[in-house]
Amino acid sequence: MAVTACQGLGFVVSLIGIAGIIAATCMDQWSTQDLYNNPVTAVFNYQGLWRSCVRESSGFTECRGYFTLLGLPAMLQAVRALMIVGIVLGAIGLLVSIFALKCIRIGSMEDSAKANMTLTSGIMFIVSGLCAIAGVSVFANMLVTNFWMSTANMYTGMGGMVQTVQTRYTFGAALFVGWVAGGLTLIGGVMMCIACRGLAPEETNYKAVSYHASGHSVAYKPGGFKASTGFGSNTKNKKIYDGGARTEDEVQSYPSKHDYV
């Protein structure tokens, strides 16, 4: 029962996490114009992985895609790659884990196969979560570096009294969504790996070995020994079924970063 719950919960947590990674990847607010200690402008700039946007005080928003591939910073390309790899691995992991769920019967699939699939999906979720966390962290590091560079020369003299003010960018909502989503996917993956240990059949690892003694035929089975310690409770031939994993729908609305007041 505990194994099924752990596996089901791991699946749901990973599902939420991957949905979050997809959402973060698509979001435009990876970096947003820093409003603190900055001359207040009537336009608000924010940027995503795929396009940059400008919102005027009237609410009019104009977004422009990054139509160049070679002209983009290598770091941005790396972040895109990490997020896409995370999504692809996560999606494959979800597909695998659906078939691995103990509460779903597919033909005469053995527990050992389900255990292997659960472990595979768990590893995929862990790598997916790490990719997302790494991608978001690389972008955040890039922002911090650029922030302090632009702060150092925030007011660049242009001769005489004329000045140009550099727009500084700070963390956008997508970064926090990405971090949380990556973390959830990672946790879900760990839970799947834990569930895998409970799913693994214990008796199939060692075949019975026959020892022939004179006059007697004694079959000796090693009993109190386990291949890996801590493989969970000895369930022998008991089969546990749970009536479907519960899912949670998380509806999040993202308030606009900049409220013109």
């Epitope: 402008t41 009537a42 400008v54 005027e56 005080s57 009237s58 007041v261």
Partner: antibody, heavy 120, light 113 residues
Amino acid sequence: QVQLKQSGPELVRPGASVKLSCKTSGYIFTNYWIHWVKQRSGQGLEWVVRIYPGTGNTYYNEKFTGKATLTADKSSSTAYMQLSSLKYEDSAVYFCSREGYGKGNSMDYWGQGTSVTVSS
Amino acid sequence: DIVMTQSPSSLTVTAGEKVTMNCKSSQSLLNSGNQKNYLTWYQQKPGQPPKLLFYWASTRESGVPDRFTGSGSGTDFTLTISSVQAEDLAVYHCQNAYYYPYTFGGGTKLEMK
């Protein structure tokens, strides 16, 4: 068509208050910012304040904080600006205007202006 | 506050002549996010409210004759009238529409000889 109609001229004593109105029509009042701009005789324009009638959010030119108070009545699609503790230098023509959508924060429609004269 | 300086303060022209007036801001009005300059031009005829001519420095408002041209970027902007007509006699104001508080130039008065 979009119209902004302002109240008539005002002659007030120093230290008194005056409330100017700007009645709008021809568009959804709650969806656009309303600005007030001051123009002293023979001089340039000076931005005073703006209000978003949909939320009541206001943004003041610091110079006019405490001098001007903005309100908006959604039911009558009218914006109001109250000027308090009037001084001689507050004598000017006050225009209300609408900020256009997708027009680079510019004001695309203007009222005819209200003349305020502060005199003892 | 951003200081907007218009030059000349007045211009005396003859009909059909080409006219150029300038506007200089104390800080760049160019937004890096969309590469647009948040400068607006208004025309104000005597006894009337200002009328919008250009926004984003060079985008002509509908109904504005094409003899009017707005140009410039960063801190230096120009309004050009290719062939002045009698109805163009007015005061022309430039406005910073980027930084709060919004600020206007002193205006350029266009007069006929």
